[in-house]
């Protein structure tokens, strides 16, 4: 019960989290600025990965996509990336584990097949998680970098005067978000983890037995052990059949009672 | 880069008219706003009127009922229409536009500047 509760959280946290971080991706406000206050009205410009917003307080706004990839600084490629292979690597988590899922069943699916399929969501979950994070972190920095001093710099260009305005840029909403859903996609990973643990097998410790006939026409159920499934009352892999089945080490004894199917 | 290139300037009787326009051209993502200053010989550049992306605008008091501004935003251009002009409108006037030109980059473009001379 416990472990189909941790994989079930585990999931709606994982989903929880890769939902916010797809919100993060696709969010404006990873930097904004608080331009100037203008007598008439004031003035922000707020950016994200793929375009450029001005806000007035009159609430006209005006977004425009950035223009090539070509023209782009690096980083912000590397802060893409690393956000849509946290999507995608969620996406494809998300799938294998709602098929791991111990409440649902498919077919004849194993319990070390899900617990297998729980493992591989879970870590996918915690890539996805730590892509977000550092996603997120890496535009951080760029935006402390860029942290300038609001001093202005005149200098003569083309066509006359550019003035640079070294305007402090400030932490997005974007950003919190991808930062909380980055956490909450790891946290659902190391829970799914957990839950693999106790989907797995606890032993599957089989050893090679040999068979020695007793008597005429005695049939013998093969394998002395059983792995433990998880289901019915032979949960401590205790030995099912005394008689017949004997490994090497153990002396042949007669056969008794049990032997018989 | 962005430019900024000014037009329409000139020698013009007191009470007369004169329309500047100004074209914005290069790499512009966001126009926050375009405006006019002037400058006249030992004196610092004053603004005359700005206009925002939505069409808000703002003039100074010297400005106020005489000039007007417009945009048109398609072709990234600023105008501005400047009526019963005197003596001491004289000046260059300057075309400023506030541009975000890339991810964390603002800045604040000045045209070569129009002369403008009203003669009494």
């Known amino acids: 019960m416990a472990v189909t509760a941790c994989q079930g959280l585990g999931f709606v946290v994982s989903l929880i989290g890769i939902a916010g971080i797809i919100a993060a991706t696709c969010m404006d406000q990873w930097s904004t600025q608080d331009l100037y206050n203008n007598p008439v009205t004031a003035v922000f410009n707020y950016q994200g990965l793929w375009r450029s917003c001005v806000r007035e307080s009159s609430g006209f706004t005006e977004c425009r996509g950035y223009f090539t990839l070509l023209g782009l600084p690096a980083m912000l490629q590397a802060v893409r990336a690393l956000m849509i292979v946290g999507i995608v690597l969620g996406a494809i988590g998300l799938l294998v584990s709602i098929f791991a899922l111990k409440c649902i069943r498919i077919g004849s699916m194993e319990d070390s097949a899900k617990a297998n399929m729980t493992l591989t969501s879970g870590i996918m979950f915690i890539v996805s998680g730590l892509c977000a994070i550092a996603g997120v972190s890496v535009f951080a920095n760029m935006l402390v970098t860029n942290f300038w001093m609001s001093t202005a710099n005149m200098y003569t260009g083309m066509g006359g005067m550019v003035q640079t305005v070294q305007t402090r840029y400030t932490f997005g909403a974007a950003l919190f978000v991808g930062w909380v859903a980055g956490g909450l996609t790891l946290i659902g990973g190391v829970m799914m983890c957990i839950a693999c643990r106790g989907l797995a097998p606890e032993e599957t410790n089989y050893k090679a037995v040999s068979y020695h006939a007793s008597g005429h026409s005695v049939a013998y159920k093969p394998g002395g052990f059983k792995a433990s499934t998880g289901f019915g009352s032979n949960t401590k892999n205790k030995k099912i059949y005394d008689g017949g089945a004997r490994t090497e080490d153990e002396v042949q004894s007669y056969p008794s009672k049990h032997d018989y199917v | 880069q962005v430019q900024l290139v000014e037009s329409g300037g000139g020698l013009v009787q007191a009470g007369g008219s004169l329309r500047l326009s100004c074209a914005a051209s290069?790499?512009?993502?966001?126009?926050?706003?375009m405006g006019w200053y002037r400058q006249t010989p030992g004196k610092q550049r004053e603004l005359v009127a700005s206009?925002?992306?939505?069409?808000?605008?703002n003039y100074a008091d010297s400005a106020k009922g005489r000039f007007t501004i417009s945009r048109d935003n398609a072709k990234k251009m600023i105008y501005l229409q400047m009526n019963s002009l005197k003596p001491e409108d004289t000046a260059v006037y300057y075309c400023?536009?506030?541009?975000?030109?890339?991810?964390?980059?603002?800045?604040?473009?000045w045209g070569q500047g129009t002369q403008v001379t009203v003669s009494s």
């Open positions: 290069g790499r512009i993502l966001n126009l926050n706003d």
């Open positions: 206009i925002f992306s939505s069409g808000t605008t």
């Open positions: 400023n536009a506030d541009v975000v030109t890339g991810l964390l980059q603002r800045n604040v473009y």
